[in-house]
Amino acid sequence: YDFTNCDFEKIKAAYLSTISKDLITYMSGTKSTEFNNTVSCSNRPHCLTEIQSLTFNPTAGCASLAKEMFAMKTKAALAIWCPGYSETQINATQAMKKARKSKVTTNKCLEQVSQLQGLWRRFNRPLLKQQGSSDYKDDDDKHHHHHH
């Protein structure tokens, strides 16, 4: 899915209002310095691509996070604010239902959610090009003029 046409500010609002709190709840009892962030993203569509991958794709040691509260809210936000996103996810969702039986929090899952927090942080706070500035290029916010 190409996240270029999502309403980034609405997704950001959904994250700050609810998703971030669910991530904090999931990570409760874990020190913020316990994991090194190794996953990064360069712009908002790329961040959403990485967020989707880490949230919904099974990885070694962390079968799936898809039934966690933060994941369900992430899916809802993407479905609402990314045109056509829902249609692309029907097959993926069915596959996930078959693969996922129970929720188990492993250390690998905690590490993965720590990575997610870093990706969301980057998504929320890109250093966007200012008017009249040529510091660097960032094309993903062509219809969102606010820096934050």
Epitope: A13, N37, S40, L127, D135, H146, H147
Partner: antibody
Framework: EVQLVQSGAEVKKPGSSVKVSCKAS????????MHWVRQAPGQGLEWMGA????????SYNQKFKDRVTLTVDKSTSTAYMELSSLRSEDTAVYYC?????????????WGQGTTVTVSS | DIVMTQSPDSLAVSLGERATINCRAS??????????MHWYQQKPGQPPKLLIY???NLGSGVPDRFSGSGSGTDFTLTISSLQAEDVAVYYC?????????FGQGTKLEIK
Amino acid sequence: EVQLVQSGAEVKKPGSSVKVSCKASGFTFSTYNMHWVRQAPGQGLEWMGAIYPGNGETSYNQKFKDRVTLTVDKSTSTAYMELSSLRSEDTAVYYCAREDDYGEGYFDVWGQGTTVTVSS
Amino acid sequence: DIVMTQSPDSLAVSLGERATINCRASESVDNSGLSFMHWYQQKPGQPPKLLIYRASNLGSGVPDRFSGSGSGTDFTLTISSLQAEDVAVYYCQQINTDPLTFGQGTKLEIK
């Protein structure tokens, strides 16, 4: 412990440059926006710019755009602010600050400040 | 640039009394239903410390006598019962639009 430790006070001549360092510890430096804020004696806070250590992207206050350069050294988790063509009005305390964990955009960790005095 | 104007410039309040500081932005700092306005406290010789984020959310470890309200262009920081340790300069900050800007500060003293 999450902290930012800045370099010591500097006295500079007008027209020269100053480079202030800010060493981070206790967090993954490369994934947080790092900001620079200055405060002239008895005055308020003024945002100078920010840098994302992950890829070196910067955003500057246009007021300082031609004179300030923000850089990072990821290997030492250190952010740098260089201000050139100094004038007496640049006499101030310069702070580095980290954005919060959650992308709210507030500055939750600050350096202790570096006093820069510009005098002939 | 968004100009942040605080009022009053200085304020003297008796211990135990309510203190109110206002901040007005030259344009809205709201985006998608959220207000991107923060409040900081600064004591002499120290860096600023976050009090309130996003207009009304209490910062970590901040006493609940502090509260924030407002949206759009008008915001208020309230200290319900002034304590001696609250003597400081208070700043509002908007982060909705570059450049990030602060209010000029309000100096709070004990009457």
